[in-house]
Interface confidence: medium
């Protein structure tokens, strides 16, 4: 007879994956509150599919393509990415995009099991805007429906690289316009991140399309079942969004509270006896005050996990509002 | 009014390269949308496309006979000017110059051929 | 052997309504404009619809046209004897990267 834990154990991870430490990780998922995040994230990632790749489409026809508007398409993703952050970022904190749910995640800005809600609602709501483009679109000028494509002359290595680099600028900007401890932010945060769509759009359209955003191509892949180099529409992104999330939260910028903690850890780990672990206990925000909050001054961040508004910090140390 | 008129020879040896010039008025081949075809009518039988050329000098080919044919365009003298190497008698045919526009580039662009030489016969014979 | 296939001849009476079917695949009708051409005896052929159903002027309203997917149709009301002739539809092949043909129909008008 074995001296097994009544709460039943899953594969190798011991302690961690009990059924309660589960049903931990997934509070404040089972909210209004929250679903009406999950919902933003579906509503803005559609409506801002829908209107962006509109303007990728080639009026030209099949028999003369008309020549790329570069500038035409920059501005409609950029602006269109500023308006769908104005609108929805005080509800869910306006990712629309799976790459920068990743690094929100990656810095401790929103709980793993909250993300994958996000994601999934991302892809789908990028899907059924581009289904609805698709359907509203003439079939002699749908094309590939902005599907997007490594150059021809460049290796899926350069493809990624480009859609990193891009992703990273991104991303970063993101970070440093919603840093609530910053004071010198003036200006239209939304439009900064906009502004830095539109700028990955002008460098990387001919080499990639530009995507910088797992889900944008994801959408128009599913409807036209182009799978032609996806996989680093995936990967790009994501690397580039984690770094930038990264290297701003953790080396640039970081939060004093996090400095303190860090060294704190660090001492403790240099006095621990070679090859022991130790475990450091945090159940606390990563920030003491509003972190990447969308509006400058004093804003107030939705708690998912009991449906009121506070400052700062909820109790599973995440900041929701965070574009 | 736009008109076009092909010109060439009217009896051509077998192996030997037939040249034809569509000499046009009433439009530029240098205006945005417009092109130039040529389509060829065995006697008793349908109409096959040949070639195109487009204001921006780009040009597309029938692919069964990409390799046989050339087209070029003269725009000062108004002309466009196909070539078809290494005849046969199966290429027997009246063939036709004609105006293409497209919509997307010209408000009255049609997406067709919308105006047809008269046309010229060509017989192949030894 | 024509890309786009259309039935070899058609007859009706005068005063009659004639249709003249085209069809294709996804890569030309589906998904360019077509276009129908008439060709009188001994005559150039003449552009009767462009894309898909709008008529050039000078094409009386007794010719229209119609598209549904792959296939096409060309419709002739109050048939008259002038207008005894070969009826081509063409369009824009994606694939091909040109220019495709019906392989023509002679409508006679009896």
């Known amino acids: 007879m074995s001296d097994r834990p009544t709460a039943r154990r899953w594969g190798k991870c011991g302690p961690l994956c009990t059924r309660e430490n589960i049903m931990v990780a997934f509070k404040g998922v089972w909210t209004q509150a929250f679903w009406k995040a999950v919902t933003a994230e579906f509503l803005a990632m559609l409506i801002f599919v829908l209107l962006s790749l509109g303007s990728t489409i080639n009026w030209g026809g099949t028999e003369k393509p008309l020549p790329v508007d570069m500038v035409l398409i920059s501005l409609c993703f950029g602006l269109s990415i500023a308006t769908m952050v104005q609108c929805f970022g005080h509800i869910s904190g306006g990712h629309i995009n799976p790459a920068v749910t990743v690094a929100m995640v990656c810095t401790r800005k929103i709980s793993i099991a909250k993300s994958v809600f996000y994601i999934a609602a991302q892809c789908l709501g990028a899907i059924i805007g581009a289904g609805i483009l698709y359907l509203v679109t003439p079939p002699s000028v749908v094309g590939g429906l902005g599907v997007t494509m490594v150059h021809g002359n460049l290796t899926a290595g350069h493809g990624l690289l480009v859609e990193l680099i891009i992703t990273f600028q991104l991303v970063f900007t993101i970070f440093a316009s919603c840093d609530s401890k910053r004071t010198d932010v003036t200006g239209s945060i939304a439009l900064a991140i906009g502004f830095s769509v539109a700028i990955g759009h002008l460098f990387a359209i001919n080499y990639t399309g530009a995507s910088m955003n797992p889900a944008r191509s994801f959408g128009p892949a599913v409807i036209m079942g182009n799978w032609e180099n996806h996989w680093i529409y995936w990967v790009g992104p994501i690397i580039g969004a984690v770094l930038a999330g990264g290297l701003y939260e953790y080396v640039f910028c970081p939060d004093v509270e996090f400095k303190r903690r860090f060294k704190e850890a660090f001492s403790k780990a240099a006095q621990q006896t070679k090859g022991s672990y130790m475990e450091v206990e945090d159940n606390r925000s990563q920030v003491e005050t509003d972190d990447l909050i969308l509006k400058p001054g004093v804003v107030h961040v939705i708690d998912v996990d009991r449906g009121e508004e506070k400052k700062g910090k909820d109790q599973s140390g995440e900041v929701l509002s965070s574009v | 009014q736009i008109t076009l008129k092909e010109s060439g020879p009217t009896l051509v040896k077998p192996t030997q390269t037939l040249t034809l010039t569509c000499t046009f008025s009433g439009f530029s081949l240098s205006t945005s949308g417009v092109g130039v075809g040529w389509i060829r009518q065995p006697p008793g039988k349908a109409l096959e496309w040949l070639a195109l050329i487009y204001w921006d000098d780009d040009k597309r080919y029938s692919p069964s006979l990409k390799s046989r044919l050339t087209i070029t365009k003269d725009t000062s003298k108004n002309q466009v000017v196909l070539t078809m190497t290494n005849m046969d008698p199966v290429d027997t045919a009246t063939y036709y110059c004609?105006?293409?526009?497209?919509?997307?580039?010209?408000?009255?662009?049609?997406?067709?051929?919308?105006?047809w030489g008269q046309g010229t016969m060509v017989t192949v014979s030894s | 052997q024509s890309v786009l296939t259309q039935p070899p001849s058609v007859s009706a009476a005068p005063g009659q309504k004639v249709t003249i079917s085209c069809s294709g695949s996804s890569s030309n009708i589906g998904s360019n404009y077509l276009s129908w051409y008439q060709q009188l005896p001994g005559k150039a052929p003449k552009l009767l619809i462009y894309e898909n159903n709008k008529r050039p002027s000078g094409i009386p309203d007794r010719f229209s046209g119609s598209k549904s997917g792959t296939s096409a149709t060309l419709g002739i009301t109050g048939l008259q004897t002038g207008d005894e002739a070969d009826y081509y539809c063409g369009t824009w092949d994606s694939s091909l990267s040109g220019v495709v043909f019906g392989g023509g129909t002679k409508l006679t008008v009896l």
């Open positions: 004609a105006h293409r526009s497209l919509s997307s580039y010209s408000s009255n662009g049609k997406d067709a051929f919308d105006i």
